[in-house]
Interface confidence: low
């Protein structure tokens, strides 16, 4: 019988009394085969963190900055439910660290030295761990003591809590530093009063606070927020443009066995029945003998954390970034107007010996890093262990969802201002022989398919948006008999076809043969019926073009193209006879890396570009055998996004319609977790 | 694509007894919640009971508490609805529903708006 005991670690006596409670209240109402509460008394939440890592505990509720230690070597616990407030309509399970300044004041987050800050008090995330922790690397040396370092950073301050003796400057703006309510710029409403009243030019608060504090919209108005790209946005627009997003309160537990669905079966049963308005003997969210005893008082339920989501995610690269500065206390000796290294995300071996290559003769531009799928790679960047990859346009959306931001366009057609230009896309087709003269869009049923990846444009999300408005079912491996699909579940039929040996097959990375559009054609031409590619893809890969063995003495007039009106066209004619357009490829990167990765990008694509005439003696960007390695091989240049650099931008409103229908479907664990941090 | 068939809707006499079942096919039946909604005429959808399939726990609605009885055959796929001590305000038409994936983010389990998978349902009605 498997144990379902939860162990719930507790940090005080009346913890302790509430644990007790807790456990016996939830055994009345809970059947016997159901989860149960175990206490564990600890003297400190280290301490709970310690002891859930040697298996002595399992569970504890944690504030952001905790969540970060118990997240770090040797602790290695993950998040695993969040205490949500609000509404169940609207749940809020975060919240945004913002600096909110006067219209009028003309300065952006870059010009910070020498102003007036007003901070919620010492010590605090949002007032002071987040901003000073960001602004760490800006900070005068030598930057310890910290507090003597910010003082001598800003022309002044309020940080209530801190010592008005040895830093005077830190309370110039409030005299005395008091550390409560009795201190008019104490708190967040304290912090927002010393910006309002004029004596401090930067409030260092919550998103919330300005709504709370200014109940006009007139008011709100003239007030705005600092964004770390150094623009300003109006204050209702927090979601685009703050310092961090905070979880507000969390459950860990182990990353692995952790009892992660145990823990959530029995937070979920605990809210049904001692929630918010449930029962009068004991309530989950109250604290008779103290204040925010195991859980917030202020919490309304539990929202299930996506297991996908690792501490780093969850907690958010600007987060991490602020506390792991605050904690080293580390800063990169380059000066900040001078780009680092780009680290360039690579997928598998094939990738990584390109890119390696690359980084040789970039001479320390470009450095790699490794990842086994497309969105590991994207969680990587996420997070800052990568910096940059270039996305076919199924997973420009998910990096979007996930706050990245597209930075260059590849561009496949020649033509005199490349870079200035990004094309308007290529064209999604379904290929087949021709010698299968009876197969048409309308009778795929049952035929073998062939996919560059699940997530994909050309190769998956076109074509089974389609077939999914015909079905309306996302049971795609019953529809064709069998197929390969790289990154399908490995019992699926729709990994019978693929070629990979052992752990290898149908991984969605160049280990598969079939992975890609050269794959996905290859699939065709030696097992498939239809192939769902580019437009490029046929003529790329016959009339000798590519010399492997499989392909060598293929010819284009051997294979057609299906039209969704269900005849058939040439592979010439793809402009009459397509799925639909899709969007370029395009290269993506975090917000706070745009700048140098499109400085550094276009340096490296006019050494090592298009412009290149011999590629079999010299390094090129843009080719790998038709492999398409780190770029698409057709890649003529990068190019500018002008305007379009949001991921709804760039896909445009119609391909992100589509994918957002084929989202029913869909099986990224990376989206779902994606979408929790911002639905 | 998932499906849910649902089964044993009818006529009773109030204080009468009646099943209804509901089998899933077309995904990894286990780790969901599933289970029984009712819509009586000009009224709004309503929890009844829910389980944690795979042997998980179990929510009822104060209403049907000590009267109705959920549970499960995870061999069959099934989840099943026993009716004892009918009422005639019981008279609906009874839905099975499955909630996957991120629709297990909702607070509760007998909010309607965490399933994303539904049947066609099936009539009971209690007359006197």
């Known amino acids: 019988v498997p144990d379902k005991t939860v162990r719930w670690c507790a940090v005080s006596e009346h913890e302790a009394t509430k644990c007790q409670s807790f456990r016996d209240h939830m055994k009345s109402v809970i059947p016997s085969d159901g989860p149960s509460v175990a206490c564990v008394k600890k003297a400190s939440y280290l301490d709970c963190i310690r002891a859930i890592a040697a298996n002595e505990a399992d569970a504890v509720t944690l504030d952001a900055g905790l969540v970060y230690d118990a997240y770090l070597a040797p602790n290695n616990l993950k998040p695993v439910v969040a205490e949500f407030y609000g509404s169940k309509e609207d749940p809020q399970t975060f919240y945004y660290a913002v600096a909110v300044v006067k219209k009028d004041s003309g300065f952006q987050m870059n010009q910070l030295r020498g102003k007036k800050s007003c901070h919620t008090g010492l010590g605090r995330s949002a007032g002071w761990n987040i901003p000073i922790g960001l602004l760490y690397c800006d900070l005068p040396e030598p930057r310890k003591p910290l507090e003597k370092a910010v003082a001598n950073f800003f022309s002044g301050s309020c940080a209530p809590c801190a010592d008005g003796t040895d830093f005077p400057q830190l309370c110039q703006l409030c005299p005395g530093c008091g550390c409560s309510t009795l201190n008019q710029y104490f708190g967040y409403s304290g912090a927002f009063k010393c910006l309002k009243d004029g004596a401090g030019d930067v409030a260092f608060v919550k998103h919330s606070t300005i709504f709370e504090n200014l109940a006009n919209k007139a008011d709100r108005d003239q007030y705005e927020l600092l964004c770390l790209d150094n623009t300003r946005k109006p204050v209702d627009e927090y979601k685009d443009c703050h310092l961090a997003q905070v979880p507000s309160h969390t459950v860990v537990a182990r990353s692995m066995g952790g009892k992660e669905d145990l823990i959530w079966e029995l937070l979920n049963q605990a809210q049904e029945h001692f929630g918010k308005d449930k029962s009068k003997e004991f309530q989950l969210f109250s604290s008779p003998h103290g204040k925010d005893l195991l859980f917030k008082d202020s919490a309304h339920g539990f929202l299930k954390v996506p297991p996908r989501m690792d501490a780093k995610m969850y907690l958010g690269y600007e987060y991490v970034t602020a506390i792991r500065n605050l904690r080293e206390g580390t800063c990169p000796e380059a000066p900040t107007d001078e780009c680092k290294p780009v680290k360039w995300c690579a997928l598998s071996h094939h990738e990584r010996l390109k890119c390696d290559e690359w980084s040789v003769n970039s001479v320390g531009k470009i450095e790699c890093v490794s990842a086994e799928t497309t969105e590991d790679c994207i969680a990587k960047i996420m997070n800052g262990e990568a910096d940059a990859m270039s996305l076919d346009g199924g997973f420009v959306y998910i990096a979007g969802k996930c706050g990245l931001v597209p930075v260059l366009a590849e561009n496949y057609n020649k033509s005199d201002n490349c870079e200035d230009t990004p094309e308007a896309g290529y064209f999604a087709i379904a290929v087949v022989k021709k010698s299968a003269s009876d197969l048409t869009w309308d009778n795929l049923k049952g035929k073998k398919s062939c996919h560059t990846a699940v997530g994909r444009t050309a190769g998956w999300n076109i074509p089974m948006g389609l077939l999914y408005n015909k079905i309306n079912h996302c049971r795609f491996d019953e529809f064709f008999s069998e197929g390969c699909a790289p990154g399908s579940k490995k019992d699926s039929s729709l990994c019978k076809l693929c070629m990979g040996s052992g752990l290898n097959l149908c991984e969605p990375n160049n280990k598969e043969g079939y992975y890609g559009y050269t794959g996905a054609f290859r699939c065709l031409v030696e097992k498939g019926d239809v192939a769902f590619v580019k437009h490029q893809t046929v003529p790329q890969n016959t009339g000798g073009k590519n010399p492997d063995p499989w392909a060598k003495n293929l010819n284009e007039k051997d294979y057609e193209l299906l039209c969704l009106d269900g005849t058939r066209k040439p592979v010439e004619e793809y402009a009459n006879c397509h799925l639909a357009r899709a969007p370029n490829h395009a290269v993506v990167t975090r917000k706070d890396k745009e700048a140098c990765v499109h400085k550094i990008l276009r340096q490296q694509q006019h050494l090592f570009g298009s412009n290149v005439t011999d590629c079999s003696g010299n390094f090129c960007l843009f080719r790998s055998e038709t492999k398409d390695l780190l770029f698409r091989d057709d890649t003529v240049c990068l190019a500018k996004l002008h305007d379009r650099n949001t991921y709804e931008k760039y896909l445009g409103e119609e391909y992100v319609k589509a994918v957002g229908n084929l989202r029913k479907c869909s099986t990224s664990s990376l989206l779902e977790a994606c979408t929790f941090r911002r639905p | 694509e998932v499906q849910l068939v649902e089964s044993g809707g009818g006529s009773v006499q109030a204080g009468g007894s009646l099943r209804l079942s509901c089998r899933a096919s077309?995904?990894?039946?286990?780790?969901?919640?599933m289970g029984w909604f009712r819509q009586a005429p000009g009224k709004e959808r309503e929890g009844v009971a829910v389980?944690?399939?795979?042997?998980?726990?179990?929510y009822y609605a104060d209403s049907v508490k000590g009267r109705f009885t959920i549970s499960e055959d995870n061999a069959k796929n099934t989840v099943y609805l026993q009716m004892d001590s009918l009422k005639l305000e019981d008279t609906a038409m009874y839905y099975c529903?499955?909630?996957?994936?991120?629709?297990?983010?909702?607070?509760?389990?007998?909010?309607?708006?965490?399933?994303?998978?539904w049947g066609q349902g099936t009539q009971v009605t209690v007359s006197s």
């Open positions: 077309g995904h990894a039946y286990g780790g969901n919640y």
């Open positions: 529903a499955l909630a996957l994936g991120s629709a297990r983010w909702y607070t509760s389990s007998l909010d309607a708006r965490a399933y994303n998978i």
């Open positions: 389980l944690y399939t795979g042997g998980g726990s179990t």
